[in-house]
Amino acid sequence: DLQEADLDLLRVTLSSKPQALATPNKEEHGKRKKKGKGLGKKRDPCLRKYKDFCIHGECKYVKELRAPSCICHPGYHGERCHGLSL
């Protein structure tokens, strides 16, 4: 597990209004895909495996955590940018 300070740093880097990092249960989405061969650029998991994770926001894949995080559209809130704010 990443240290708490590293998590905070990642959040601040991803968004000016940091959201909690949301890491889906990998059991719910099958086994991890194997890493691609060669030195070519890896495809962004947010475009496939986690394409539906952020409901009203943008998915940012945090390589250090092997996990997606969400940056919410204005007015939305929550780990998955799922809800209209109060």
């Epitope: 990443l2 905070d8 909690a20 990092l21 809130h77 780990e79 998955r80 799922h82 809800g83």
Partner: antibody
Framework: QVQLVQSGAEVVKPGSSVKVSCKAS????????MHWVKQAPGQGLEWIGE????????TYNQKFKAKATLTVDRSTSTAYMELKSLTSEDTAVYYC?????????WGQGTTVTVSS | QIVLTQSPTTMAASPGEKITITCSAS?????MYWYQQRPGFSPKLLIY???NLASGVPVRFSGSGSGTSYSLTIGTMEAEDVATYYC?????????FGGGTKLEIK
């Protein structure tokens, strides 16, 4: 594996306060909001609020804003909910819960009984 | 806040029977979530994002719907399915739950 372990049952007097704890393990505590849900006897589920352990940011259900106070202690990976000015209406089971794609992990529940 | 109305409130079914529980929302929601709560236990996630099966949930459970109308279906009722079922939305804060459907066995 992810575990949320809550404090034991409480019997308290009307007008007093109670603090329920939820100790998390098996994941990075700061990485997920902690939510709290109320279930009164024989009743359904009510969302109380959520706290972001990383920032301390809290969103309450307006209904519980004057009743509940959510806090966390990151050093012990523990979330707390304090309930104040207790009445018989607050007699319920209180759950902490955490998402994956929804509320997938739940504590075992803490029964709070308000009785004189 | 969005009010979720479940029907029926209580129902009894025979083993092998197909069960459908409906959840009607007072305003349109993006997705619906379903939970099972057996007596004396914490709720358990069954369905997320309207139709996706949570980890470890038997394939006899399925979810569908859109807008303000959603449903949970149990393909073939089994004795272990005796529980109360709740729908939940979080498209608008605060997240809300339906009043529950108590499923009993005949």
């Amino acid at each position: 594996q992810v575990q949320l372990v809550q404090s034991g049952a409480e019997v308290v007097k009307p007008g007093s306060s109670v603090k329920v704890s939820c100790k998390a393990s098996g994941y990075s505590f700061s990485g997920y909001y902690m939510h709290w849900v109320k279930q009164a006897p024989g009743q359904g589920l009510e969302w109380i609020g959520e706290i972001n352990p990383s920032t301390g940011g809290i969103t309450y259900n307006q209904k519980f804003k004057a009743k509940a106070t959510l806090t966390v202690d990151r050093s012990t990976s523990t979330a707390y909910m304090e309930l104040k000015s207790l009445t018989s209406e607050d007699t319920a089971v209180y759950y902490c819960t955490r998402i994956t794609w929804a509320f997938a992990y739940w504590g075992q529940g803490t029964t709070v009984t308000v009785s004189s | 806040q969005i009010v979720l109305t479940q029907s029926p409130t209580t129902m009894a079914a025979s083993p092998g029977e197909k069960i459908t529980i409906t959840c009607s929302a007072s305003s349109s929601v993006t997705y619906m979530y379903w939970y099972q709560q057996r007596p004396g236990f914490s709720p358990k996630l069954l369905i997320y994002d309207t139709s996706n099966l949570a980890s470890g949930v038997p394939v006899r459970f399925s979810g569908s719907g859109s807008g303000t109308s959603y449903s949970l279906t149990i393909g073939t009722m089994e004795a272990e399915d005796v529980a109360t079922y709740y729908c939940q939305q979080w498209s608008s804060y605060p997240p809300t739950f339906g009043g529950g459907t108590k499923l009993e066995i005949k």
